[in-house]
């Protein structure tokens, strides 16, 4: 669980000719508000689907009245952040739509009137817990500047907010099978919280909120004993529909035991037999002490002298891992800005900068956007080389002169038609096919080849599986 936060910095006329008329006037004062809609994934169809990750509406901004004869300035904005809480994992890749709405406060009969001034959309990658990301988007002659981030709500941590952390119960170490919770080293990973009501005897979970059944049990909460009389296979995940055991992976498949541990199946789950020096449910906890010299590459070992006291290796620059055994690819952190080439020289990092940039990390832009033109509502962005344009939706190329055709790759299957709608590509399927990409045949009896229709949808409804 966590919160996506959006901070609007400015909304006003973009650079270049054709400045928009102010949306407010002395006769018709108005104020702005914003709506954000989030959808998971980077797929084009995200724009057609509901705001599956969530949506939020800002407060109303201050009332604004245009000064006669003055050009439209940046318009006064609402206070505060737009916050979109998400209950499940943060997907890492997401699509957004930000709408700017105008509330007219003139002598409207029946209260204020609202109209949509601008809509921008985009697809981004974002790790939870990271810094604020800045963005500029154009919508016609308007320009929206904003920042966004995703942060986890305690006790969740990690780039997807899926790991749970709790304060340590003992000062020196975490419980069996539980690791320290980086970056909060004074906390420990918490046991997973399974779906509410999941049987503690017959169910388990590997992700929060799920309930997976042990052998011999079925049902959404693993409370229904399986009848094995009509079943062929002696083991496997239970089928809730038949009450039967169907073939499937055993608990030891893929060997869940770490560090060379051997796995054996038990009536309820599995058991790891760990090699000397390791213990825990999956042999992931080391019983080694600092006396055994476990830290490689000059790492400094800190910890107690007895096997029950965990040790920690403090690694020198350039190394990582619980035993400092991994060399850090420091270039993987992409320290060189603006497309600079990263060179890891061992003792130091070097950035080889592209034309137009300088500085130890290529952070200094030697070239501003003066006199540079980006076509079709594109914005010239400082820091992208000699001249980089951030293009409006639907345009691409160095100067945004090329129309980006999302249909060029022919994404609609079986003769379906692809349309370049402003919100993303849209497929209209040929008769006999359905799905967001026309990938599913519709059987003559009206049923589709889909495994199952989502709740509330008939299988015969086309293009709704988004």
């Amino acid at each position: 669980a966590g919160v996506f936060e959006l901070q609007i910095h400015s909304f006003g006329p973009g650079p270049g000719p054709g400045a928009p008329r102010s949306p407010c006037s002395a006769r018709l004062p108005c104020r702005l508000f914003f709506r954000v809609c989030l959808k998971p994934g980077l797929s084009e169809e995200a724009a057609e689907s509901p705001c599956a990750l969530g949506a939020a509406l800002s407060a109303r901004g201050p009332v604004y009245t245009e000064q006669p004869g003055a050009p439209a300035p940046d318009l006064p904005l609402p206070d505060g952040l737009l916050q979109v809480p998400f209950r499940d994992a943060w997907p890492g890749t997401f699509s957004f739509i930000i709408e700017t709405w105008r509330e007219e406060l003139g002598d409207q009969i029946g209260g204020p009137a609202w109209s949509l001034l601008a809509r921008v959309a985009g697809r981004r990658r974002l790790a939870a817990g990271g810094p604020w990301a800045r963005d500029i988007q154009r919508a016609g002659a308007w320009e929206l500047r904003f920042s966004y981030r995703a942060r986890c709500e305690p006790p969740a941590v990690g780039t997807a907010c899926t790991r749970l952390c709790r304060p340590r119960s003992a000062p020196s170490r975490c419980g069996p099978g539980l690791r320290p919770c980086a970056p909060l080293e004074d906390e420990c990973e918490a046991p997973l919280v399974c779906r509410a009501g999941c049987s503690p005897e017959h169910g388990f979970c590997e992700q929060p909120g799920e309930c997976r059944c042990l052998e011999g049990w079925t049902g959404p909460l693993c409370t229904v004993p399986v009848s094995t009389s009509s079943c062929l296979s002696p083991r496997g995940p239970s089928s809730a529909t038949t009450g039967c055991l169907v073939p499937g992976p055993g608990p030891c498949d893929g060997n869940p035991c770490a560090n060379g541990g051997s796995c054996s199946e038990t009536p309820r789950s599995f058991e790891c037999t760990c090699p000397r020096g390791f213990y825990g449910l999956r042999c992931e906890v080391s019983g080694v002490t600092c006396a055994d010299g476990p830290c490689f590459n000059g790492g400094l070992c800190v910890g107690g002298a007895d096997p029950d006291s965990a040790y920690i290796c403090h690694c020198p620059p350039g190394f990582q891992g619980s035993n400092c055994e991994k060399r850090v690819d420091r270039c993987s952190l992409q320290p060189c800005r603006n497309g600079g080439l990263c060179l890891d020289l061992g003792h130091a990092l070097r950035c080889r900068c592209r034309a137009g940039f300088a500085g130890p990390r290529c952070e200094h832009d030697l070239d501003d956007c003066a006199g540079r033109a980006c076509a079709n509502g594109g914005t010239c962005v400082e820091g992208g080389g000699a001249h980089r344009c951030s293009c409006a939706l639907g345009f691409g190329g160095r100067d945004c002169r090329e129309r980006a055709d999302p249909c060029a790759a022919r994404p609609c299957a079986h003769g379906g038609r692809c349309y370049a709608h402003f919100s993303g590509l849209v497929c209209a399927c040929a008769p006999g096919y359905m799905g967001a990409r026309c990938e599913f045949p519709v059987h003559p009896d009206g049923a589709s080849a889909l495994p199952a229709a989502p709740p509330g949808l008939r299988p015969g409804d086309p293009q709704r599986y988004l």
Partner: antibody
Framework: QEQLVESGGGLVQPEGSLTLTCTAS?????????MCWVRQAPGKGPEWIAC???????TDYASWAKGRFTVSKASSTTVTLQMTSLAVADTATYFC???????????WGPGTLVTVSS | QVLTQTPSPVSAAVGGTVTISCQST????????LSWYQQKPGQPPKVLIY???NLEIGVPSRFKGSGSGTQFTLTISGAQCDDAATYYC??????????FGGGTEVVVK
Amino acid sequence: QEQLVESGGGLVQPEGSLTLTCTASGFSFSSSYDMCWVRQAPGKGPEWIACIYTGDGSTDYASWAKGRFTVSKASSTTVTLQMTSLAVADTATYFCARNSGYGYFGLWGPGTLVTVSS
Amino acid sequence: QVLTQTPSPVSAAVGGTVTISCQSTESVYGSDWLSWYQQKPGQPPKVLIYQASNLEIGVPSRFKGSGSGTQFTLTISGAQCDDAATYYCQGYYSGYIYAFGGGTEVVVK
């Protein structure tokens, strides 16, 4: 600014022929759209005639328009509608319109008037 | 595919609510590929709503579309004098077929 402009309308005799042209500006047919013709008789509602899908050049017609009307792409910015065996009932304003998704016409031309009269 | 609009004409006072219905003889594509247009004399139709309920950019929020399958409604809440016009529904059907409704004239008094 994306725009459509129709041309080629005018007075034509019954049983005569006429070709209308739709010219796009601000965009081209290199992207995938349905470029369509819709007509509206005086005092009546709009009536769909035909479309050409710019993605692959395939065409679709209203059942009543098949045979007498032909839609084609003349260039990357022009679409034409050829009309034959015109009758007085074909008198209408003919609009060029674009569907760029979800089956609606988000961009229209101002229309060109075709009068069929002897 | 025939779209039938009711009623016509319809009259409303300024600030009042106007409701126009549109019924199709068969389900539109995707159950929601239906749009609404406003037309004033001498002008082409202007789209208000697409995909049954999506407001086109620049259209005041007093216009609202709803419905799915074969039955759709356009509602104008707090009608203004400028809303006096003829309104048309238009559907898109499987097989790449388009159809328009017969229109509903709205008078605002």
